[in-house]
Amino acid sequence: TVIDESALTPEQRLGLKQAEERLERDHIFRLEKRSPEYTNCRYLCKLCLIHIENIQGAHKHIKEKRHKKNILEKQEESELRSLPSPSSAHLAALSVAVVELAKEQGITDDDLRIRQDIVEEMSKVIMTFLPECSLRLYGSSLTKFALKSSDVNIDIKFPPKMNHPDLLIQVLGILKKSALYIDVESDFHAKVPVVVCKDRKSALLCRVSAGNDMACLTTDLLAALGKVEPVFTPLVLAFRYWAKLCYIDSQTDGGIPSYCFALMVMFFLQQRKPPLLPCLLGSWIEGFDPKRMDDFQLKGIVEEKFVKWEYNSSSATEKNLIADENKAKADEPKDDTKKTETDNQSNAAKAKHGKSPLTLEAPNQVPLGQLWLELLKFYTLDFALEEYVICVRIQDILTRENKNWPKRRIAIEDPFSVKRNVARSLNSQLVYEYVVERFRAAYRYFACPQKKGGNKSTMDPKKKEKGKLSSKKPVKSD
């Protein structure tokens, strides 16, 4: 029932106002102007973004599960926002913990050599039967973001005349026959079809793909960043290890592919104030327009400290304009040499290319522990994962609308294949909510000084444990 407010007595009017003030505490507000879509609705729950007809409906909404859940989340968010700033001793302890973890969990040069040997061995085995192919190591082994137990990612480069599915079927047969590998299986229905096997000597799991050029380009980018920015590798390792502890890094179980965590760290370092990493495209490029960013394609790493880009106009309108121009030119009988000259000029303008630096000129002075805490805070409180896209190419924050991607869960753009959301494997709302909840627990855990014996906490101890980084060193502060 909609109340005719003009007929109310003073008592009733005050009663209505009081009820509305109470509702505001529950994030339900009276609409100044009614929405044209919901003409009967007088109120809006700003927390759940739901239109409500009247006071009775509002009281009913308050009792709903989702509203209660959102209220709790809001309360937790404000609690997290009001956590005191960490002391320098606390940050120093965190820095030590992250460095220790990177040493403890990351791969050593010896581990890398073992992985490179696996590729060399496999190259010999496969090239005996497929001499025109070559094998390359990619992924976390090459970027040095691998944990000790991480899979070995191997890609097969093959000539254009070869058929991709046939090639993988042949590789499956070759590896099955070899005594060097056990548990050889195919996973051709995966997003990236692979042959999976275990290297008998090292017991490491190998995932063999073919023609996975984009992944190799991303690997080169992340590896180069690891070399030029000292904080990058330990932060990624800590982040990956945390994700592994929380069971959110398994793509096959609806989690996030592990290299996404590296892109998330990269994005955070670009977005923090002041930034520690530059974006890959920007105003330093003459004529760059963020609205037309997809006309600039990233092409790979040069000199280990630059990313190469090319300008190719993909705008339909521009193509149509050029087509019309060409048609007009064709209709006019003109001197052939002159026509070719103007065409060449127009092509030159369209085929711009250049390189962008991977680092900023000013050296980083921020302690690693502070960055770890900021990273968790960024994804817990500052960056709306559901609303925006993690895009490492430009400084501007991309909305889902910009990409035409649905407003759900996590979106991470592949810098080399910009139509691909590399976090699309996280496709369950429940898993997404779990990820968000893990971020909150981790930020709370690392933001609060920890005692050696463990803090008395109201948090679920099992959850709290998952927030920890290193099994050896508890984070403590004096």
Epitope: L14, G15, L16, K17, Q18, A19, E21, E24, Q56
Partner: nanobody, 118 residues
Framework: QVQLQESGGGLVQAGGSLRLSCAAS????????MGWYRQAPGKERELVAG???????YYADSVKGRFTISRDNAKNTVYLQMNSLKPEDTAVYYC????????????WGQGTQVTVSS
């Protein structure tokens, strides 16, 4: 159960001032509109002033500019500051606490006598 206890009534000369207080016991003070009613002999009880949790106020035309209602949510108390009193303000003043939603219910105080002599 909410209990309301008024104080501050008494005899005052015309043009004088009085301050009424009403202390509410019970933990749900914030749910209620708090107000003051009065009843003069042989007349109906009328709403003099009311105030919501957020401080929205109402005054009867006869007292506008002379009376001020305020509430202290921390102390569960509502006040009525009465200035420039007139003989026609003589009445028993009742403190009231009420809600309209989800349904109407009202709690009343015992009342306090205010007499304005000319």
């Amino acid at each position: 159960q909410v209990q309301l206890q008024e104080s501050g009534g008494g005899l005052v000369q015309a043009g004088g001032s009085l301050r009424l207080s009403c202390a509410a016991s019970g933990t749900i003070f914030t749910y209620f509109v708090m107000g003051w009613y009065r009843q003069a002999p042989g007349k109906e009880r009328e709403l003099v002033a009311g105030i919501t949790l957020g401080g929205t106020t109402y005054y009867a035309d006869s007292v506008k500019g002379r009376f001020t209602i305020s509430r202290d949510n921390a102390k569960n108390t509502v006040y009525l500051q009465m200035n420039s009193l007139k003989p026609e303000d003589t009445a028993v003043y009742y403190c009231a606490a009420w809600v309209e939603y989800p349904r109407r219910y009202v709690y009343w105080g015992q009342g306090t006598q205010v007499t304005v002599s000319s």
